[in-house]
């Protein structure tokens, strides 16, 4: 049994770090493997994560880490019974992937303006709460070329656009993701998409 693709880990900067890796063949991750993790330098208990399968040869482990500072670094040991398959380290503050925003809603009743709102995925007492910026993706279900990204660089989880910037009479979908510049994070996953029918009053043409 060998590791084909070494574990890579990301932290949600809240309570969970997720590590993924691939084995060299089909593996029952939960029965055959264990991922041990422990803080470097600080005296603390070693913790064990039981991985789950993620495709035939893929494994994923959700490491519980609920008290983390910038200086913290973890050793990671991947074991198959008594055999050490891989040893590495992981610094949560340097590998942050924010949680995905939720509750994306499109308000279409605001005088030819579309108001998109969503929820910040972090509670107000989390450091990332006031540091997230967003990207909103809007696309047409009918026309694959009608695909646009709006960067929301202010803190408020909302976006206003004129309905007239989109085509009238057709259906659109939107989704949103987040990142935090302060930790040079990766982008979060996209939120679930929401659908609406875009319609607005065309202005009268002047002749």
């Amino acid at each position: 049994m060998k590791v084909l693709q070494e574990p890579t880990c990301v932290s949600d900067y809240m309570s969970i770090s997720t590590c993924e890796w691939k084995m060299n063949g089909p593996t029952n991750c939960s029965t055959e493997l264990r991922l041990l993790y422990q803080l470097v330098f600080l005296l603390s208990e070693a913790h064990t994560c039981i991985p789950e399968n993620n495709g035939g040869a893929g494994c994923v482990c959700h490491l519980l880490m609920d008290d983390v500072v910038s200086a913290d670094n973890y050793t990671l040991d991947l074991w198959a019974g008594q055999q050490l398959l891989w040893k590495g380290s992981f610094k949560p503050s340097e590998h942050v992937k924010p949680r995905a925003p939720g509750n994306l809603t499109v308000h279409t009743n605001v005088s030819d303006t579309l108001l998109l709102t969503w929820s910040n995925p972090y509670p107000p007492d989390n450091y990332l709460y006031n540091h997230l910026t967003y990207a909103v993706n809007i696309w047409s279900e009918n026309d694959p070329a009608d695909f646009r990204i709006y960067n929301v660089t202010y803190l408020e989880p909302s976006l206003r656009i004129a309905a007239s910037t989109l085509k009238s009479g057709i259906s659109y979908r939107a989704r949103v993701r987040a990142w935090a510049q302060c930790y040079n994070t990766t982008w979060s996953e996209w939120s679930p998409s929401t659908k609406w029918h875009n319609s607005y009053r065309e202005p009268f043409e002047q002749h």
Partner: antibody, heavy 124, light 107 residues
Framework: EVQLVESGGGLVQPGRSLRLSCAAS????????MHWVRQAPGKGLEWVSG????????GYADSVKGRFTISRDNAKNSLYLQMNSLRAEDTALYYC?????????????????WGQGTLVTVSS | EIVMTQSPATLSVSPGERATLSCRAS??????LAWYQHKPGQAPRLLIY???TRATGIPARFSGSGSGTEFTLTISSLQSEDFAVYYC?????????FGGGTKVEIK
């Protein structure tokens, strides 16, 4: 108002022990990590030890590892430093410091509140 | 461990002038740097964290900049109460380490 008051310092002979205490008030003590930082006469600041809110993780500078033990009593809002096998180079003003941020994920550790310090002199 | 080096050791400045203090890390600490002010007989006071974020109640004349290995604390117009020793501290790695300090004295 956040207050940190250290006590327990004094003159002690090399090889002997001393226990420092820090009484905390003005904040929810059991939400925060706490630390000890010292300053030798005429020198700069040196981090000595730190302890997480639940005592689940503890750290020591190499210079005191194996000799000093940090602990806390959240019910009493108190932080302690048990210093054994003291040496002349442990002579310093010892500060109790509250970690900035809160329990959970946070930047740090840096220290947003400090006590006035308690002086430890190790001499024969 | 990460070694923090501050310069100059002493800075002589007249009240109202600008003071620029430097702090260098032996390896990158990203933005994980704090600055403290320390006066004799008093508790140290947090000025800056995250390399550039002013702590609560700190006047706007104090500003921090830099990332990686080079950091600067600037006091735009020195007031009489600003004469003190200033320390930088990295919190990118355990053990936490401080610079040797810069004493800002009256010229």
């Amino acid at each position: 108002e956040v207050q940190l008051v250290e006590s327990g310092g004094g003159l002690v002979q090399p090889g002997r022990s001393l226990r420092l205490s820090c009484a905390a008030s003005g904040f929810t003590f059991d939400n925060y990590a706490m630390h000890w930082v010292r300053q030798a006469p005429g020198k700069g600041l040196e981090w000595v030890s730190g302890i997480r809110w639940n005592s689940g993780s503890i750290g020591y500078a190499d210079s005191v590892k194996g000799r000093f033990t940090i602990s806390r009593d959240n019910a009493k809002n108190s932080l302690y430093l048990q210093m054994n096998s003291l040496r002349a180079e442990d002579t310093a003003l010892y500060y109790c410091a509250k970690e900035g941020g809160y329990s959970g994920y946070r930047p740090g550790p840096f220290f947003d509140y400090w006590g006035q310090g308690t002086l430890v002199t190790v001499s024969s | 461990e990460i070694v923090m080096t501050q310069s100059p050791a002493t800075l002589s400045v007249s009240p109202g002038e600008r003071a620029t203090l430097s702090c260098r890390a032996s390896q990158s600490v990203n933005y994980n740097l704090a600055w403290y002010q320390h006066k004799p007989g008093q508790a140290p006071r947090l000025l800056i964290y995250g390399a550039s974020t002013r702590a609560t109640g700190i006047p706007a004349r104090f500003s921090g900049s830099g990332s990686g290995t080079e950091f600067t604390l600037t006091i735009s117009s020195l007031q009489s109460e600003d004469f003190a020793v200033y320390y930088c501290q990295q919190y990118n790695n355990w053990p936490l380490t401080f610079g040797g300090g810069t004493k800002v004295e009256i010229k």
